[in-house]
Interface confidence: low
Amino acid sequence: ILGGREAEAHARPYMASVQVNGEHLCGGVLVAEQWVLSAAHCLEDAADGKVQVLLGAHSLSQPEPSKRLYDVLRAVPHPDSRPDTIDHDLLLLQLSEKATLGPAVRPLPWQRVDRDVEPGTLCDVAGWGIVSHAGRRPDRLQHVLLPVLDRATCNRRTHHDGAITQRMMCAESNRRDSCKGDSGGPLVCGGVLEGVVTSGSRVCGNRKKPGIYTRVASYAAWIDSVLA
């Protein structure tokens, strides 16, 4: 997260760290007791490493009573996701068991109504991604509030030049932005999961390159079918 601040500890009980061989790789969001939603491209970086999900964490390194690392029983990338595009950049991870719920671990309701969030709406994005262009990685969860940007502006030739489909949304990126390591994390508007940070190699913090998020409402049928 660029230009953000440290999050209130455990105030985002849905927040997950998708880890490979014990290292944070991507963000994720608990959407059901045994399921974490993340970004499909995260798996590409996992190679053959052991994928696990950390829940109930604020600090990645410090012991915390609510922290627990879960093995992944099943990884289900969206069937249409491809390495060369950010389309359909969603991944569902089934935990080896149902998460133990409490004040620091709780699924987040996700948006099912397939309607764009009003431009200008302030949404919260959080993650353990880099906090500087130099690549400094935080130990504690960071967050930032970002205004949603209308798709027409986001699709301008000077911005993302038509790459933003109806199944994506954008948020402003003027110094405050999601960045590398935040991919798969939640964009939360009004207490509801609206978007998942896409995992392209986009430049961060440049207002001409808004943050791109996969709209979960566009994938309700797929999410339901996997969780069923």
């Epitope: 059901a32 309701p109 339901d224």
Partner: antibody, heavy 122, light 107 residues
């Protein structure tokens, strides 16, 4: 204005089942968990369980796992609780109530239905 | 399960008095405590969460305090309309559990 409208009182015989409804309006139905709470003179308020209207995922109080089944119909923004194998101990007022989030942490039940009285009697 | 105990089933007070209703948790619940008011014939109403945060529209004569296992709801100047049942509830871990309730009676 948030409103939770519950179905009317039920008089049922021991061993029978009952299905209570709770119609939500005034907010995005899928945005908040729907909880069910039992109120009886003997045991005060007891949380039965909750359902995530987005996914249909449920969490039950173990004491009610064999008694209650929670479902939702998203198209009508209605939550349901099915109670089976009723006995006199199940006679109570049953409430639906939405979760309340502060900073995205669950912190209680903000909005309640008016309650449905279930009386189990031969 | 976490047990929430309200030791006083009834409390008697006069209009204008200050009254404190207590609640004890069977384990440390880290201020994850809510308070509800239930008037006769009505549904419960959320007053306080996180032990001390007033819910929207709740008069400031209602204050919550406490930490660890011990929590208190205080009404600084009791009004006639405060005649009701008051319940504490832990929102620390599932299953969410309530106290047995304290009935506030006006002398």
């Amino acid at each position: 204005e948030v409103q939770l409208q519950q179905s009317g009182p039920e008089l049922v015989k021991p061993g029978a089942s009952v299905k209570i409804s709770c119609k939500a309006s005034g907010y995005s139905f899928t945005a908040y968990y729907m909880n069910w709470v039992k109120q009886s003179p003997e045991k005060s308020l007891e949380w039965i369980g909750d359902i995530n209207p987005s996914t249909g995922g449920t969490t039950y109080n173990q004491n009610f796992k064999a008694k209650a089944t929670l479902t939702v119909d998203k198209s009508s923004s209605t939550a349901y609780m099915h109670l089976k194998s009723l006995t006199s101990e199940d006679s109570a007022v049953y409430y639906c109530a939405t979760t309340y989030y502060s900073g995205n942490s669950y912190v209680g039940f903000a909005y309640w239905g008016q309650g449905t009285l279930v009386t189990v009697s031969a | 399960d976490i047990v929430m105990t309200q030791s006083h089933k009834f409390m008697s007070t006069s209009v204008g008095d200050r009254v404190s209703i207590t609640c004890k948790a069977s384990q440390d619940v880290s201020t994850a405590v809510a308070w509800y008011q239930q008037k006769p014939g009505q549904s419960p109403k959320l007053l306080i969460f996180w032990a001390s945060t007033r819910h929207t529209g709740v008069p400031d004569r209602f204050t919550g305090s406490g930490s660890g296992t011990d929590y208190t709801l205080t009404i600084s100047s009791v009004q006639a309309e405060d005649l009701a049942l008051y319940y504490c509830q832990q929102h620390y871990s599932t299953p969410w559990t309530f106290g047995g309730g304290t009935k506030l009676e006006i002398k």
